[in-house]
């Protein structure tokens, strides 16, 4: 059994989240994950889900009684989702930590927007980029 | 030329964000995107980047002078990143809008954690999970 299972059960008790009534009014994540079979689509959704859990865990980082459980789960997420790749995890964390209200961050984001957009569609990497993108001058 | 280019230039002017070169170590997103070539890795990162822009645009939704630019860019993001798939976009938006401080959301998230974790690694869908992952102890 993966280590996260026991620790997640521990968290369920802590949050009083074991009862079936918690599942009332639909799911948060599971229903959405069911909709997407294609790996890249799943990554789009899972990226948001993982960042949600990281934020949630951060809110409870000072709570001694669940610290070990949280750390174990985060570590297992690191193995499963980031394939134990520290650089991948660090880049992800960096992205999740940018403050949308920071004026410098806003201006940088706007500055980079055109280049970010040019890379958004899968075709952008394969050399099949539209001529208009190749001609763009920032 | 893609419609977003002109509108992004308009936003640059509005933010007075200039045309100076952005050094690699000074970028928010471009340096990170450069690190990842694998499509699923890119989607993990781009998912965070796109949600950042959506949040940023939400902050400026009442600003008449850039409304058209913002709407055009969002629409182009929809085409490029979500492949014009409304369901994909809606599921994504749903995930980004969950409040991490809402107690009911917290309980649901913890309730679903075990199943979410089980689906995180690509192999989880194919039944070919690595033995090392099965043995991993956090």
């Amino acid at each position: 059994q993966d280590p996260y299972v026991k620790e997640a059960e521990n968290l369920k008790k802590y949050f009083n989240a074991g009862h079936s009534d918690v599942a009332d009014n639909g799911t948060l994540f599971l229903g959405i994950l069911k909709n997407w079979k294609e790996e890249s689509d799943r990554k789009i959704m899972q990226s948001q889900i993982v960042s949600f859990y990281f934020k949630l865990f951060k809110n409870f980082k000072d709570d001694q009684s669940i610290q070990k459980s949280v750390e174990t789960i985060k570590e297992d997420m690191n193995v499963k989702f980031f394939n134990s790749n520290k650089k991948k995890r660090d880049d992800f964390e960096k992205l999740t930590n940018y403050s949308v209200t920071d004026l410098n961050v806003q201006r940088k984001a706007i500055h980079e927007l055109i280049q970010v957009m040019a890379e958004l569609s899968p075709a952008a990497k394969t050399g099949k980029r539209k001529r208009s993108q190749m001609l763009f001058r920032g | 030329q893609d419609p977003y280019v002109k509108e992004a230039e308009n936003l640059k002017k509005y933010f007075n964000a200039g045309h100076s070169d952005v050094a690699d170590n000074g970028t928010l997103f471009l340096g990170i995107l450069k690190n990842w070539k694998e499509e699923s890795d890119r989607k993990i990162m781009q998912s965070q980047i796109v949600s950042f822009y959506f949040k940023l645009f939400k902050n400026f939704k009442d600003d008449q002078s850039i409304q058209k630019s913002v709407e055009t860019i969002k629409e182009d993001m929809n085409v490029k990143f979500f492949n014009s798939n409304k369901k994909k976009r809606d599921d994504f938006e749903k995930l980004t809008n969950y409040s991490v401080t809402d107690l009911n959301v917290q309980r649901k998230a913890i309730h679903e954690l075990i199943q979410v974790m089980a689906e995180l690694s690509p192999a989880a869908k194919t039944g070919k999970r690595k033995r090392s992952q099965m043995l991993f102890r956090g």
Epitope: Y98, S99, D102, V105 | K13
Partner: antibody, heavy 117, light 106 residues
Framework: QVQLVQSGSELKKPGASVKISCKAS????????MNWVKQAPGQGLKWMGW????????TYVDDFKGRFVFSLDTSVSAAYLQISSLKAEDTATYFC??????????WGQGTTVTVSS | DIVLTQSPATMSASPGERVTLTCSAS?????MFWYHQRPGQSPRLLIY???NLASGVPARFSGSGSGTSYSLTISRMEPEDFATYFC?????????FGQGTKLEIK
Amino acid sequence: QVQLVQSGSELKKPGASVKISCKASGYTFTDYGMNWVKQAPGQGLKWMGWINTYTGESTYVDDFKGRFVFSLDTSVSAAYLQISSLKAEDTATYFCARRGFYAMDYWGQGTTVTVSS
Amino acid sequence: DIVLTQSPATMSASPGERVTLTCSASSSISYMFWYHQRPGQSPRLLIYDTSNLASGVPARFSGSGSGTSYSLTISRMEPEDFATYFCHQSSSYPFTFGQGTKLEIK
């Protein structure tokens, strides 16, 4: 190369007005905002606000609302700071500084305003 | 308003010496900027985005920090480095500067 050239020193009486100019060259004026910074004698730097050179919209710090006005003449790539009803405490050196992509990356040489009766 | 507190207010050092100046912010910020100003001159940008060297600034200058705690280090003081140093934040309105640290020759 980028240059910001400010107008010369001013000696004014209390109650008078002054208008300082900051002429930019070496870049596209409307691509970068312009900050104004005050430095009283022997003191530190105090940000007064900035003007968006594309939209013309000004942002003022609370301490500089009312008697202080930022303006532009984009045809000559110039930004202006006007101070009315001058007081002794307005005696300072005023700098314009380009709101560069990262920070206040280029500064004018400063204009000293002395308010004395 | 975010208050930036620099320490020390004045510091004496010798040429060739390693010097570290600190700047503490009253709230967390994403980036810190550093300027220096020689008497009778306008300020000059040294460091942007906490740790990046501005154009033309010698490599002996470096910046670091995060959250509320930031520092500027000069690895080997040169005669022209004796000046007043200001930290600056433009993460939220109003932009603010530290009160300055004056570096004097010992």
